[in-house]
Amino acid sequence: NECPELQPPVHGKIEPSQAKYFFKDQVLVSCDTGYKVLKDNVEMDTFQIECLKDGTWSNKIPTCKIVDCRAPGELEHGLITFSTRNNLTTYKSEIKYSCQEPYYKMLNNNTGIYTCSAQGVWMNKVLGRSLPTCLPECGQPSRSLPSLVKRIIGGRNAEPGLFPWQALIVVEDTSRVPNDKWFGSGALLSASWILTAAHVLRSQRRDTTVIPVSKEHVTVYLGLHDVRDKSGAVNSSAARVVLHPDFNIQNYNHDIALVQLQEPVPLGPHVMPVCLPRLEPEGPAPHMLGLVAGWGISNPNVTVDEIISSGTRTLSDVLQYVKLPVVPHAECKTSYESRSGNYSVTENMFCAGYYEGGKDTCLGDSGGAFVIFDDLSQRWVVQGLVSWGGPEECGSKQVYGVYTKVSNYVDWVWEQMGLPQSVVEPQVER
């Protein structure tokens, strides 16, 4: 018995294609690339029907439906734009992922273009089905930092957004009687990590051993400008406190530490990371000018509430900054060796300041970033962390501020942050 002639579905075909079909003949219905066989609301790659004894087909011819990649996955810190009208998500449609500029940049300068494949997945030529990564942009404040030609003596008020990486670290040890509390600065490296000096996060209860403060006792404020007004600031508790394992309290060698924030902070005009330098044992070149910012909080009797709310009895309510030249290593070593005491300026430190002394050598909290503008990458790079020297004998002649040489610790920092160097290339100074 002969079965009726078959019409292939639109965007599909039937095989084998014959003039006549008889009892027990079978045909396979398939669809063109980018289409799927649809039968009873079920999608499939092919569908088989058979010519029955009574001259009828075992099933109706299914339809071919265009493949739909559906709504693309959301990209953290990113946006999606559709290239086709009506935001189509069907076969051969194109979308483009982009990062929330200017605060995030796409890793490896990926195009971000994804095409809906015949398999029903969004595909990128380089990443395949993996989503791109939006990394925080670093070292590019929303406001231009001042030209470094004219020297600044003493401190200047910083405009909001001038030092978007600046963090205020508040340590309050409630396990002590009375409660112990102190303050320091730090620098935002990513949405989740703060770089600071180890001595800021060390518990002074122990002198023969280096013990970090408990993470529960650490609060970090970002986007803070005036300590009397914390409404615009982001505060975060610490998930981890990591001191450099070789930090030495005798001479402050390896005075570097990290705080991992409990939650990533949203980046914006007043909260942006600073760039890490490349691994460079020499550190910043002598006479290069850098900037250090800080509130200069030094009064031991100030309560946390006073600092954050009223800002009373602080050196400055508004974030200050100062411009300082890097001092040749030999000159700095000599200046400390000539004084009584076993001060050692190691290869993990560099000095900055002016021979004639002045307030410039002691402005800025411990742990704050000494940043230098890198002409090649056009970004601000953290070359130093306020470590010792200046704050104790402010303004003394030829008493330079001593800074942790961050470039010696780049590998250690990446290792702690759990990011392979390749992932963070955009953050490394070129």
């Epitope: 002590r176 409660n179 001595h199 002198d207 023969t208 005798q250 009064n299 031991p300 704050p391």
Partner: antibody, heavy 116, light 112 residues
Framework: QIQLVQSGSELKKPGASVKVSCKAS????????MSWVRQAPGKGLKWMGW????????TYADDFKGRFVFSLDTSVRTPYLQISSLKAEDTAVYFC?????????WGQGTLVTVSS | DVLMTQTPLSLSVTPGQPASISCKSS???????????LNWLLQRPGQSPKRLIY???KLDSGVPDRFSGSGSGTDFTLKISRVEAEDVGVYYC?????????FGQGTKVEIK
């Protein structure tokens, strides 16, 4: 090279106050706490408490709460011990010692004599 | 407060002979960080104290190696392998584990 130099001996009348200083040199001052220790004539040593030189927060042993105050002037690297309402039993040599717990370097001591 | 008990309270030693001082604490001095903050110092006549040993057995720089410290938990010992004339004075143990830090009553060492 690490030195703690204390102020000189004091003779005070009961009810008066005294302030003992301890000038530190030769190390990063804010890296170590500073302890204060009392030694009464012919007696042993008694730990009075310590001050965190980074935060400026003092901690007192129970026997030294009230009339005893530890303070700091970081700019001149000097901790101070002030005793108010002096009593005859406060007569002692008062030592400063580097460290909250280490007490690895000691000042030469300051004799405070309370006598009418 | 942790009570530190030293024995003997005085000791008269012939030069070149060994000496041993015991220090017992009323509770274990092992801290939660795994370290034992037990220290020894010497106060020579008319002088300020000088730390000799920290963390039970670590010698301070400049301290002769004839001095040694040992012990754990609540029982500690300071040993001088060969006493010299400059070793005279009062030896104190003290603990920095439990607040407030406390000293032993002192052991006076003199030369025979």
């Amino acid at each position: 090279q690490i030195q703690l130099v204390q102020s000189g001996s004091e003779l005070k009348k009961p009810g008066a106050s005294v302030k003992v200083s301890c000038k530190a040199s030769g190390y990063i001052f804010t890296s170590y706490g500073m302890s204060w220790v009392r030694q009464a004539p012919g007696k042993g040593l008694k730990w009075m408490g310590w001050i965190n030189t980074y935060s400026g927060v003092p901690t007192y042993a129970d026997d030294f709460k009230g009339r005893f105050v530890f303070s700091l002037d970081t700019s001149v690297r000097t901790p101070y011990l002030q005793i108010s309402s002096l009593k005859a039993e406060d007569t002692a040599v008062y030592f400063c010692a580097r460290g909250g717990e280490a007490m690895d370097y000691w000042g030469q001591g300051t004799l405070v004599t309370v006598s009418s | 407060d942790v009570l530190m008990t030293q024995t003997p309270l005085s000791l008269s030693v012939t030069p070149g002979q060994p000496a041993s001082i015991s220090c017992k604490s009323s509770q274990s001095l092992l801290d939660s960080d795994g370290k034992t903050y037990l220290n020894w110092l010497l106060q020579r006549p008319g002088q300020s104290p000088k730390r000799l040993i920290y963390l039970v057995s670590k010698l301070d720089s400049g301290v002769p190696d004839r001095f040694s410290g040992s012990g754990s938990g609540t029982d500690f010992t300071l040993k001088i392998s060969r006493v010299e004339a400059e070793d005279v004075g009062v030896y104190y143990c003290w603990q920095g584990t439990h607040f407030p830090w406390t000293f032993g009553q002192g052991t006076k060492v003199e030369i025979k």
